[in-house]
Each structure stands twice: as C-alpha cells, then as structure tokens.
C-alpha cells in the first residue's frame, strides 16, 4: 500500500528572466527513493538516480542546475516556461509518487498590470 | 476593457460531445492564462483545468481528464474546451477565466449545458 | 487535492451590519517563496463571478474598501465593513498554491 504523500513548493508566480527552484518532498513513508524525473508537460528535464547521481536533458542543460537537494534550478526564464512541471519519484517497494507544480512566467509588462502583490 | 464572450447554451443527448467557445478581447490573449470552471446546481465551483495560449500547454483537474480537451486559436483570441461521451452530471454551467498570478481576473459570461434525452 | 472549507454556509445580515466569512484549508497555502495564492470572488445572481481580494489581502481594481481579506497559513478571513444591497450573493474563496486549485463551498450571503 502506498502510504507516502509528495510536499511540493506550490505554484510559483516569476518575471521573465529570473530564476526560481522546483522542489518535492516525499514523506510519510519509508520506501527508498531509487530516482526522481522532472518532467514538464511531457518533456523530460532531468533525473536524479540514487546511485548515478544527476543528468539534464541536453536541450535544457544551458538554464537547468541540479538542486538544491532533489530539486531543480531554472534559469533565465521565458514565457515559454510557463506550464505545469511534475517530480516524480520512483521508489521501492511503494512505486511511483507523483508532485505537480505551476509555474507562471510574466513579461514585464504584464507584471506591471492587474492583479500586483503588495510588498509588506 | 477585458471581455471573455462565451458561446450560447447548449441541449445535447447523452452520449455526445460538444465545444464551448471563448472569445477574448481587450487584453494580449497570448500574455495570460485561460481557465475553465464548471458550476453545478447553481452553487459548487470546480476547476476544470487551464490552458497557455502562448505555447498550447494544458494543465488539468484529474477528475476531467479525458472528459474535457482545452485548445486555443491564437489567430482569433479564442479558447474552447470541448466535452466529451456527455451524461446528466455533465449538465451544469461552465464559465472560461483568464487568470494572472493564479487568481482569476476576468469571467466569461458563462455557457448553460443541459444534458437530456 | 487541498480542501476548502467555509463558514457559515448561509450568513443573514441587515444593511450596515459588518460581516466575517472564513475559509479554511486543509494544507498550508503558502509557497516555498512566502506568497499565498488565495482569492475571494462574489458571484451575484444572473452574473459571472467577480473577483475581490487577491493573494490574501489585495482588493482588486474597483473593489471598494470595505472589503477587506487577512489571514495567513491556512485559516483565511474576509471582512465586510458595511454591507450594502449590491453586497448580496454567494461568496467564495479560492487556494491556487497547490494543484489543483480549489474552492470553498459558498457563504450566501442574503438579508435578513
């Protein structure tokens, strides 16, 4: 029985150009964690294997660092970034858990419009 | 001014499908989100799911996959979500809704989809 | 998927009165940056839902100010200084931190 649950950053609001890190937590179980896949819609960004350590897809290897921890660095963002990113963790013996995260990236012009966050 | 027009109701049989319209205007349609949301008995909101018009990616509620398909035209500023194998619990009214920074800005004006044979 | 809950269900008021509703959420609805995705939106009769407050506290252009939204982590409020005839309707609240976003069941809020 699958008992673990994936903590994930939240949905990340960012202006085009800047960087922002992807982050899952696996918890509430005890299965090892044998990879972690990042994937966005149905590209394959990175993978991080237990034993091999880390490999970014070669289109991305220019704006994706590796961490911190099993999460993923992106850099210079583009509105073309905008979308949904997956972590998936393959353990054992539960299988597969997966965390689902969105990511907005504005053009600065559109940041500077509608719906603005106050600083505190 | 923001406008999101959505296309007229809908009696279909059970068993088809169908294709609601959204039409904006007023804004950079590729510079925003495109959600769609289903309101049932006049009361309950769900999120459907949503689209990126600049690059055609989608995001969904599980609970619609495989019963909603979000596309968009970016030669006409229109978004559509398509309903597919309609039963009674498909009946219900579904509004689209741009969003910025994951909150939703500006509301279609609804599409009623009665379900019945 | 994060639930959302509201209170009360049904709120009766008389113009003038000031009115709580509160939303809930069964996670903490801040990101690993600080920002908390959680909106309130007034749906009137006949009309499409419209947005009031944005990321806990922001009122929406064109909202006016006695509508008021606080809270934090999971427990979120929104205020009503004076209610006025326009104010009546269902009111609900939205988390889009986590996927998929969810919303609250409705407060209506009618007269008395």
């Known amino acids: 029985m699958m008992t673990g649950t994936i903590e994930t950053t939240g949905n990340i609001s960012a202006e085009k150009g800047g960087s922002i890190i992807l982050q899952c937590h696996l918890s509430s179980t005890t299965a090892q964690v044998t990879q972690v896949n990042w994937e966005q819609q149905d590209q394959l960004l990175a993978i991080c294997n237990a034993d091999l350590g880390w490999h970014i897809s070669p289109s991305f290897k220019d704006r994706v660092a590796p961490g911190p921890g099993l999460g993923l660095t992106l850099q210079s963002l583009t509105v073309n970034d905008t979308g949904e990113y997956f972590c998936i963790y393959h353990t054992y013996p539960d299988g597969t858990y997966t965390g689902r995260i969105f990511l907005e990236v504005l053009e600065s012009s559109v940041a500077e419009h509608g719906a603005r966050f106050q600083i505190p | 001014e923001v406008q999101l027009q959505q296309s007229g109701p809908e009696l279909v049989k059970p068993g088809a499908s169908m294709k609601i319209s959204c039409k904006a205007s007023g804004y950079s349609f590729t510079g925003y989100i495109m959600n769609w949301v289903k309101q049932s008995h006049g009361k309950n909101l769900e999120w459907i799911g949503l689209?990126?018009?600049?690059?055609?990616?989608?995001s969904y509620n599980q609970k619609f996959k495989g019963k909603a398909t979000l596309t968009v035209d970016k030669s006409s500023n229109t978004a559509y979500m398509e309903l597919l194998s309609l039963t009674s619990e498909d009946s219900a009214v579904y509004y689209c809704?741009?969003?910025?920074?994951?909150?939703?800005?500006?509301w279609g004006q609804g599409t009623t989809l009665t379900v019945s044979s | 998927d994060v639930v959302v809950t509201q209170t009360p269900l049904s709120l009766p008021v008389s113009f003038g009165d000031q009115v709580s509703i509160s939303c809930r959420s069964s996670q903490s609805l801040a990101n690993s940056y600080g920002t908390t995705y959680l909106s309130w939106y007034l749906h009137k009769p006949g009309q499409s839902p419209q947005l009031l407050i944005y990321?806990?506290?922001n009122r929406f252009s064109g909202v006016p100010d006695r509508f008021s939204g606080s809270g934090s982590g999971t427990d979120f409020t929104l205020k009503i200084s004076t209610v006025k005839p326009e104010d009546l309707g269902m009111y609900y609240c939205?988390?889009?931190?986590?996927?998929?976003?969810?919303f609250g069941g409705g407060t209506k809020l009618e007269i008395k």
């Open positions: 689209i990126v018009p600049n690059n055609g990616g989608t």
């Open positions: 939205l988390q889009n931190t986590h996927q998929p976003p969810t």
């Open positions: 990321g806990i506290s």
């Open positions: 809704a741009r969003s910025l920074r994951f909150s939703f800005d500006y």
